[in-house]
C-alpha cells in the first residue's frame, strides 16, 4: 500500500487484546530495522485470515508469545 | 467514555493557516493510528489525513499534500492538524476520528470512534 | 487512484423492508480493505463494516455486509426508523490511500 511514509513499519495501531492461540494462523515477530525503529508484532487469525497488530509491551502479548513459543519448543524435536 | 474533541475551527482568510486539534480521552491514545477527515457544507466524507500509533506513519490526501501537516503528541492525547494556505475548498467540517485496534497496512478496521467535528471557513 | 461509485443515489423505502445498497470500485480491492459508514444529519458517521463484511462492535445483525474484487453490497435486513440516514463505503489502499463513496441516503417513502 502506497502510504506516503518515511519509514516502513507495518503498524496503524496495536492491540493489547488477548489472543487465543487456539485462533492464531500464524504470528509473526518483525525486530527493529533501518526502515521501522521498532518491534512489530502481527498475529494472523485464523477466522477471515484477519491480521492484527499487537502490542509488544502489553503483559496479555508477552504471554502468548511465551505460549506460542513453549509449543513450538514441545513440537520441535 | 471513550471521546475524541476537535477544537481550533474558525473563520480565516484564504492565504491564511489555521491549527486544529483534537483531545482524546478514555482510552491509551499512543496505542492508535488517527485521522482527520473533512465535510464540505452539503457534501459527502472526504479523508485528509492520517498518522500512525507512534507518529511515523502519516499519509494526506492529493488535495492537501504539500499544505496540512498532520501530528500528535501521546503525552498530551493530542492529534493536530496544521492547515496552511487555506483555500475557499478547504471549507468543511473536520472530524478526527481513531482507527480501529490492530489496523495495519495488510488489514483495516476501520475509523471507530469519530469526533463531533470543528467547522472550518475559509472566506475573504 | 481508485473510484468508489454508490448506488443508488438515494433509496425509498418503508420501515420494515429490506435495503441493498451497492458500492463499486474502479480496481478490484481486497476484501480486507473495505469499510460502510452510517451518518445521521448534524451527528459524526459511525463505523457499521470493516474486512468488508465483519460488523463493528454494537452494531445489530441486521446490518451485513458482501462482496469482493469490485462489488460490495450493505444490506439491511428490515430497516427501523432511526436506519434513515446516509452510508458510505470506504476503500483504503490506493493513493490517495482513503477513499470514500459518495454515499447513498436511505429516506422514508
Known amino acids: 500500500i502506497p502510504l506516503s511514509r518515511t519509514v516502513r513499519c507495518t503498524c496503524i495501531s496495536i492491540s493489547n487484546q488477548p489472543v487465543n492461540p487456539r485462533s492464531l494462523e500464524k504470528l509473526e515477530i518483525i525486530p527493529p530495522s533501518q526502515f521501522c525503529p521498532h518491534v512489530e508484532i502481527i498475529a494472523t487469525m485464523k477466522k477471515k485470515g484477519e491480521k492484527r497488530c499487537l502490542n509488544p509491551e502489553s503483559k496479555a502479548i508477552k504471554n502468548l508469545l511465551k505460549a506460542v513459543s513453549k509449543e513450538r519448543s514441545k513440537r520441535s524435536p | 467514555q471513550v471521546q475524541l474533541v476537535e477544537s481550533g475551527g474558525g473563520v480565516v482568510q484564504p492565504g491564511r493557516s489555521l491549527r486544529l486539534s483534537c483531545t482524546a480521552s478514555?482510552?491509551?491514545?499512543?496505542?492508535?493510528?488517527m485521522h482527520w477527515v473533512r465535510q464540505a457544507p452539503g457534501k459527502g466524507l472526504e479523508w485528509v489525513a492520517v498518522?500512525?500509533?507512534?507518529?511515523?506513519?502519516?499519509g494526506y490526501a492529493d488535495s492537501v499534500k504539500g499544505r496540512f501537516t498532520i501530528s500528535r503528541d501521546n503525552s498530551k492525547n493530542t492529534l493536530y492538524l496544521q492547515m496552511n494556505s487555506l483555500r475557499a475548498e478547504d471549507t468543511a467540517v473536520y472530524y478526527c476520528?481513531?482507527?480501529?485496534?490492530?489496523?495495519?497496512?495488510?488489514?483495516?478496521?476501520?475509523?471507530?470512534?469519530w469526533g463531533q467535528g470543528t467547522t472550518v471557513t475559509v472566506s475573504s | 487512484e481508485i473510484v468508489l461509485t454508490q448506488s443508488p443515489g438515494t433509496l425509498s423505502l418503508s420501515p420494515g423492508e429490506r435495503a441493498t445498497l451497492s458500492c463499486r470500485a474502479s480496481?478490484?480491492?481486497?476484501?480486507?480493505?473495505l469499510a460502510w459508514y452510517q451518518q445521521k444529519p448534524g451527528q459524526a458517521p459511525r463505523l457499521l463494516i470493516y474486512?468488508?463484511?465483519s460488523r463493528a462492535t454494537g452494531i445489530p445483525d441486521r446490518f451485513s455486509g458482501s462482496g469482493s474484487g469490485t462489488d460490495f453490497t450493505l444490506t439491511i435486513s428490515r430497516l427501523e426508523p432511526e436506519d434513515f440516514a446516509v452510508y458510505y463505503c470506504?476503500?483504503?489502499?490506493?493513493?490517495?490511500?482513503?477513499?470514500f463513496g459518495p454515499g447513498t441516503k436511505v429516506d422514508i417513502k
Open positions: 476520528a481513531r482507527e480501529g485496534a490492530g489496523s495495519s497496512v495488510y488489514y483495516y478496521y476501520g475509523m471507530d470512534v
Open positions: 478514555g482510552f491509551t491514545f499512543s496505542d492508535y493510528g
Open positions: 498518522i500512525g500509533y507512534g507518529g511515523l506513519i502519516k
Open positions: 480496481q478490484s480491492v481486497s476484501s480486507s480493505y
Open positions: 474486512g468488508a463484511s
Open positions: 470506504q476503500q483504503y489502499g490506493s493513493s490517495p490511500i482513503f477513499t
